[in-house]
């Protein structure tokens, strides 16, 4: 089964792990109260406590199972032969208002089970309606989805969830809204938030479509809520570029997609292309991303306001490759105010008159924009006409750092005391520290301080994510969970190796002379007593 | 189940107004719009124009400009076309037809129709 | 403004297939829908959407567009299928809902 915690890291202390040899791991969430780690993975549910000891292990699968069944095996009798399937998690969401987690696997088309937080045990597995079969592809990175509460005491929560369908768009939408009942057997579970004859809260990709270009899919890659919006980062095979001729080079296209929280029938559909560009090089794989709160520095940098989201991502190198993408790769920062910006504009733009919808794998057709006195401002969430829309121009990010040999595959950042720290996982098992500071002498937006292994030569999967005390950055390999502080400041020995390491988190304690936090140095704010600047170490 | 129901025949001399009403039941009157349809003796269908129930807003086809109101009653799911200066040629079956959005979509119920005869 | 135009009349022997056809400048840039107009009922609606089916109508009626042209094809057409057919886009110019003219299915 699975691993005790034990030792890893080099020169540090040890770093608390928790492996797992049978079965790949695939996601990860942290419970923000208490702490508690919950982790999906090929047949199984892990809980750990937040030092990554084994609490509980809920068992998936293997299933007796095939995928052209539909609906599944345990509900009609189906004339393919059974199987033992793997059941790969691809969705793992906590529901903090009912106390429960949302596993969603790939066997049985795609249903998703209920699990208690406290104990794992299974609260339900919606099954029998084909409103409960998600997806039945397995590649575990590619589905998204985001919760929303239902306004407290009254109104029910939602998911969002969009998910690749590997041509089966007659099963499966690619992007929904659905209902989370508080009973779990509830006939309703995951039924569309709104249907009707017409119109609906998904969007199925045309058959027509698929029939030009068999492959085309979109691949979720993280999704967020932002005031009022939903938004996802995804890969989608770039039909412009890509030959209909099956045996040509596909090539992706980065698109951020936004809905409107309260748009149940997706009136509001926006999908913009999104990557950066560095020195002439294109960066337009998206690999991972990240929300934040920009930190005081950098917000005033950025001539934002501390509570407002700006978005790090990680792109690869150009537009082909999505499963092995190149690794070249960089670290990018977008506002949340300049997406929100571009998409009005465009908006308004096309509710002038202008241009077209622009939106070819999903309309198969050039409808152009209709004028319409409507005034568009930031909260607007559509009509039935000038939508689905598509935007025309790539929304371009701020690059920060590039990795020219490693390659950047995921992302987290937190604000500490004003200063922005990000962390970037890489395919060899790394975690990079960066500083994000737009003012550094030289031009330098971003400095990476330190590197440290979680686990080497194994890539660093999607959810990089910190302990709600934001002590600790839990990194998950196929294999493995890695607990690595967000700071060693210990490691430094002297003041100014100490103050050289550029570690934001770190100060010279003049009292125990050692390098440390400031707030676990004892009388760090009297005089001469903590050094956070290289040339007090000089003056001590 | 969605229905529709219309007002009943009408007649009328020219130069006089009608107004028919069209009453929704089955479903959430404010969800749809309502299109007015017509058909002449021997004729095809003509668009009228559209209401939108939620806010009232309308839009009227350039050849009814003028001469066209569409009005709705939220609190009985009713609405309302009043054709005024009617001419013998304004003698038709007048349909009223739902649907889910003003451009993009097709008029999935309609109305019984209601006949609209100007004579002199 | 704009126009749509349709064969007056189109003959069909039952269980054939009959294609209705429509057109209009750069038709396949808007959505055509289509309605069947029986002698003495209101219209029905069969494709909206160029080529969705509303429920109820049955499966061997399908619709395309492209070009300057979208068709209503009525595969294996029984004699309940004869009726007036309109079918109907919307003119981004001037704000219309503009109908074809309609043409009257015979199944012989």
């Known amino acids: 089964e699975a691993g005790l915690p034990r030792a890893g890291g080099g020169s540090q202390p040890p770093f608390r792990t928790f492996s797992a040899s049978d079965w790949g791991l695939t996601h990860l969430v942290v419970h923000e109260q208490t702490g508690e780690v919950y982790v999906g993975a090929v047949n199984r549910i892990y809980k750990l406590s937040g030092n990554l000891t084994l609490l509980r292990a809920h068992v998936t699968g293997p299933v007796e199972d095939n995928e052209k069944c539909y609906p599944p095996p345990s509900v009609q009798s189906c004339p393919h032969g059974l199987g033992s399937t793997d059941n790969v998690n691809k969705l793992l969401l906590l529901d903090y208002a009912a106390n429960r987690l949302l596993a969603c696997g790939s066997a049985s088309q795609g249903i998703c089970q209920f699990l208690r937080l406290d104990d794992l045990f299974k609260l339900g597995e919606p099954h029998h309606r084909k409103e409960h079969y998600l997806s039945s592809v397995q590649e575990a990175g590619s589905m998204a989805g985001v919760l929303i509460a239902g306004p407290p005491g009254q109104g029910q929560a939602k998911l969002f969830v969009g998910t690749p369908i590997d041509g089966k768009s007659e099963y499966f939408p690619t992007l929904s809204s659905r209902r989370l009942m508080a009973n779990e057997e509830d006939a309703d579970m995951f039924g569309f938030v709104y249907q009707d004859e017409f119109v609906s809260s998904q969007l199925k990709i045309p058959s027509d479509t698929l029939s030009k270009f068999p492959a085309f899919d979109i691949y979720y890659v993280y999704s967020f809520r932002s005031e009022q919006f939903v938004y996802y980062l995804t890969l989608q095979l770039d039909t412009q570029l890509t030959s209909p001729d099956a045996a040509g080079e596909h090539f992706f296209t980065s698109k951020i997609v936004r809905l409107c929280v309260d748009d149940p029938k997706f009136y509001s559909y926006v999908e913009f292309p999104i990557g950066c560009e560095q020195a002439g090089v294109e960066y337009r794989l998206v690999q991972d991303a990240y929300l934040s709160r920009p930190g005081r520095a950098l917000a005033h940098q950025l001539g934002l306001a501390e509570d407002e989201d700006v978005l790090f991502t990680v792109f690869a190198q150009g537009q082909k490759n999505r499963v092995k993408p190149p690794k070249e790769s960089a670290l990018c920062l977008f506002t949340l105010r300049a997406i929100k910006e571009k998409i009005k504009e465009r908006i308004q733009s096309c509710y002038r008159g202008e241009g077209k919808l622009s939106l070819p794998w999903l309309l198969n057709k050039e409808l152009g924009c209709i004028n319409s006195p409507l005034q568009i401002d930031d909260d607007f969430c559509g009509q039935d006409f000038n939508q689905p829309l598509g935007g025309t121009v790539t929304i371009e990010g701020t690059p920060l750092f590039v990795d020219k040999d490693d390659g950047l595959t995921a992302v987290a950042a937190y604000d500490y005391r004003g200063r922005t720290v990000v962390f970037a996982g890489t395919r060899s098992g790394r975690i990079r520290k960066i500083l994000v500071d737009l003012s550094n002498p030289g031009g330098r937006p971003a400095l990476a301080y330190e590197s440290v292994v979680a686990q080497e030569g194994s890539p660093i999967l999607r959810d990089l994510v910190l302990s709600p005390n934001h002590q600790y950055l839990y990194a998950m390999t196929e294999k493995q969970v890695t607990r690595v502080p967000v700071e060693s400041c210990v490691q430094y020995t002297s003041c100014e190796l100490c103050l050289g390491s550029r570690d934001p988190h770190c100060g010279w304690c003049v009292l125990h002379s050692i390098c440390s936090r400031r707030d676990a140095c004892e009388r760090a704010d009297e005089p001469q007593r903590f050094a956070a600047d290289l040339l007090q170490c000089v003056q001590l | 189940q969605v229905q529709l129901v219309q007002s009943g025949a009408e007649v009328k001399k020219p130069g006089a107004s009608v107004k028919v009403s069209c009453k929704a039941s089955?479903?959430?009157?404010?969800?749809?719009?309502m299109h007015w349809v017509r058909q002449a003796p021997g004729q095809g269908l003509e668009w009228m124009g559209i209401?939108?129930?939620?806010?009232?807003?309308?839009s009227y086809a350039q050849k009814f400009q003028g001469r066209v109101t569409m009005t709705r009653d939220t609190s009985t799911s009713t609405v309302y076309m009043e054709l005024s200066s009617l001419r013998s040629e304004d003698t038709a079956v007048y349909y009223c037809?739902?649907?889910?959005?003003?451009?993009?979509?097709?008029?999935?119920?309609w109305g019984q129709g209601t006949t609209v005869t100007v004579s002199s | 403004s704009y126009e749509l135009t349709q064969p007056p009349s189109v003959s069909v022997s039952p269980g054939q297939t009959a294609s209705i056809t429509c057109s209009g400048d750069?038709?396949?840039?808007?959505?055509a829908s289509w309605y069947q107009l029986k002698p003495g009922h209101s219209p029905v609606l069969v494709i909206y959407?160029?080529?969705k089916r509303p429920s109820g109508i049955p499966e061997r009626f399908s619709g395309s567009n492209s070009g300057n042209t979208a068709t209503l094809t009525i595969s294996g057409t029984q004699a309940m299928d004869e009726a007036d057919y309109y079918c109907?886009?919307?003119?981004?110019?001037?704000?219309?809902?503009?109908f074809g003219g309609g043409t009257k299915l015979t199944v012989l």
């Open positions: 750069k038709l396949e840039d808007k959505y």
């Open positions: 089955g479903y959430t009157f404010t969800s749809y719009y």
């Open positions: 209401i939108n129930p939620s806010g009232g807003s309308t």
């Open positions: 037809a739902r649907a889910p959005g003003h451009y993009y979509y097709g008029m999935d119920v």
């Open positions: 959407q160029d080529s």
């Open positions: 109907r886009a919307w003119d981004s110019n001037t704000g219309d809902v503009v």
